[in-house]
Amino acid sequence: VPRWRQQWSGPGTTKRFPETVLARCVKYTEIHPEMRHVDCQSVWDAFKGAFISKHPCNITEEDYQPLMKLGTQTVPCNKILLWSRIKDLAHQFTQVQRDMFTLEDTLLGYLADDLTWCGEFNTSKINYQSCPDWRKDCSNNPVSVFWKTVSRRFAEAACDVVHVMLNGSRSKIFDKNSTFGSVEVHNLQPEKVQTLEAWVIHGGREDSRDLCQDPTIKELESIISKRNIQFSCKNIYRPDKFLQCVKNPEDSSCTSEI
């Protein structure tokens, strides 16, 4: 008799999820000498242990603690780049500026980037059919809780000047409900972080507006200032040129406004 399976509103676990996580772990530890000591089989076991046989709407940060412990990594705390709704450009940036790091440049972020996963209560099966959607089903699902946990830890580790890349093409440039707005902003440590600098990325070629004056940016400034952290904002009018100048800063065109 086929067993009844809960139907969730979100897409199911990414196909070949165990193999993907294990392969990514092996690749990452080969590329990053400081993580060569990591046993990828243990990492997978800890990852699996966080959600297998558990109700996918009842996942806690505690469930991920064994994985967090195995994936402990020291990133230079003054070289952290946060982002919201503009992941691709943030990743292009850290590929060029190799001494800065997004969450996805760390082992745990790299393992889970763009993947979906969930299990089922009381069975050791991975659910490849559907997983809970954050809005339509529940917020305490395996994927959301994972990103909340790693994002909180990443923000807590930051120091000195923290940069955040924001999407100037969105109606809410700063969104209080994003991971950045709901988790990272509130977990920056004022005793360690002096300044948060927002880089607002423009989408249109002819867009010369000062998006640092946007009401949502003013809201971000207010939240940050109340936390005793200085706030700074910079318009990036031409993201293509920005990346080029980060790559080749001495280029003669890199003195003008970008």
Epitope: N78, M100, V161, T195, S232, K234, C245, V246, P249, T255
Partner: nanobody, 126 residues
Framework: EVQLLESGGGLVQAGDSLRLSCVAS????????MAWFRQAPGKEREFVAS??????????ADSVKGRSTISRDNANAKNMLYLQVDRLKVEDTAVYYC?????????????????WGQGTQVTVSS
Amino acid sequence: EVQLLESGGGLVQAGDSLRLSCVASGRTSSFYTMAWFRQAPGKEREFVASVGWSGGSTLYADSVKGRSTISRDNANAKNMLYLQVDRLKVEDTAVYYCATRRGVSSSRLVSEYDYWGQGTQVTVSS
């Protein structure tokens, strides 16, 4: 090659203010982070303040935080760096160095800066 030239040092009274300047020339860029360090006699060179490429992301050592302002001017391909220090103390006596590093992140580490000026002497008397 980047050349850095500091100016503005001298003998000042405790409690007074001082403004140091640094001009960067050669193959420099507004996409460099710029910083001030200082070295007192018999001591290690220490971080004072830095400013990122945008001019907005500033960072200060605890020893000068709240009484100093770092700023930069990237206009006309002329990269200028400034440091205003108020309420000077005898402990601020040192040679002040301008430094720059490739990259947009600030750093307190001497080893992360690529180019250095010759320094300008600041002596604070009581």
